[in-house]
Amino acid sequence: SSPTSSASSFSSSAPFLASAVSAQPPLPDQCPALCECSEAARTVKCVNRNLTEVPTDLPAYVRNLFLTGNQLAVLPAGAFARRPPLAELAALNLSGSRLDEVRAGAFEHLPSLRQLDLSHNPLADLSPFAFSGSNASVSAPSPLVELILNHIVPPEDERQNRSFEGMVVAALLAGRALQGLRRLELASNHFLYLPRDVLAQLPSLRHLDLSNNSLVSLTYVSFRNLTHLESLHLEDNALKVLHNGTLAELQGLPHIRVFLDNNPWVCDCHMADMVTWLKETEVVQGKDRLTCAYPEKMRNRVLLELNSADLDCDPILPPSLQTS
């Protein structure tokens, strides 16, 4: 979110001034060219300036850094490593900066980094060690608490023949560095599936946003370990039904709120357990808005208003009785 200080408290660095002093080592509190700085708010904004590199002369006081709407393309290893280090940097927003590659160790030497937003960048090449910084089987814990990765999927012709889900999950799990992560947003990424291991290895999660993906099933996903989970956003996916195992796991989470709107629920005999559960549970937010999409005769029926007699499956006839 934006800093609370008024715009007038931001100082701007004139490009001619920056070039005039660029030969000397940077002054500790100067403001980079094309950026606005507020020492009072500990905030630097370099927004919509078509920057092609991360500024080298960021002030040491920076706590909130906005580098949105640029042309950064690549975050190399140690992209924010400075001498002295940016020890206060806690929130880093890189959304919409046309990043397509984040290399191993890109966020190293940021000991206080708690919030990172990489949304709206077409990440064709996200290193498995982007967040862990090392290829050790167990890395030093990352300080990250919030990781926002909404709409980072590149266009289909730019995915380089790799599983996009697999690439993202590899970065989340490498070195077990993100054990302290509390918020993970992965909305709008065309995910077809959620790899089985990912949630088990992020035990501190409080908020998980998987909305606006293409998830068809949660059958192989386990929420059992996520005992702290408070919100699970599954709106706008391709879910057809939630099966008993998933329902029981969700019901067993003590603080959970689940959001299920706008999924194409199939209201046949396989839906009976979910309807029964919905009628009893308090964990689903807006459960009265959930409606059937299929079969045609059930379209737009409210799930909570269905009874077992409504939920039938067409019998599968033996081949000898099938008609052409």
Partner: nanobody, 122 residues
Framework: QVQLVESGGGLVQPGGSLRLSCAAS????????LAWFRQTPGTEREFVAA????????RYADSVKGRFTISRDSAKNTVYLQMNSLKPEDTAVYYC???????????????WGQGTQVTVSS
């Protein structure tokens, strides 16, 4: 090895337009950036523009911003340079370059084409 073949150069009047093309072939799997540089006799190669092959980022030299547009067709591994409002000082040999990094320095690029001559003159 990577091969880069430029085309589209020629003679044009001041204020006119040209479109250069550069087709990359060979072992292009490690290429992340395609760029255009230009050179006049007795000078070093000057950065003009660059684009990411698998992304959307672009960058331009200040001298061409607003006049030149770089674009690409990833499926064909081809990069284009649309040059409008051409000036006599744009006269040079234009080279296509390919590399992994995101840089305006010629030293960052491992692969170079043979160049195509652009002459802006009345």
């Amino acid at each position: 090895q990577v091969q880069l073949v430029e085309s589209g150069g020629g003679l044009v009047q001041p204020g006119g337009s040209l479109r250069l093309s550069c087709a990359a072939s060979g072992h292009t799997f490690d290429i992340k950036t395609l760029a255009w540089f230009r050179q006049t006799p007795g000078t070093e190669r000057e950065f003009v523009a660059a684009i990411r092959l698998w992304g959307t980022a672009t960058r331009y030299a200040d001298s061409v911003k607003g006049r030149f547009t770089i674009s690409r067709d990833s499926a064909k591994n081809t990069v284009y340079l649309q040059m409008n409002s051409l000036k006599p000082e744009d006269t040079a040999v234009y080279y296509c370059a390919a590399g992994r990094d995101w840089s305006a320095f010629s030293s960052a690029y491992d692969h170079w084409g043979q160049g195509t001559q652009v002459t802006v003159s009345s």
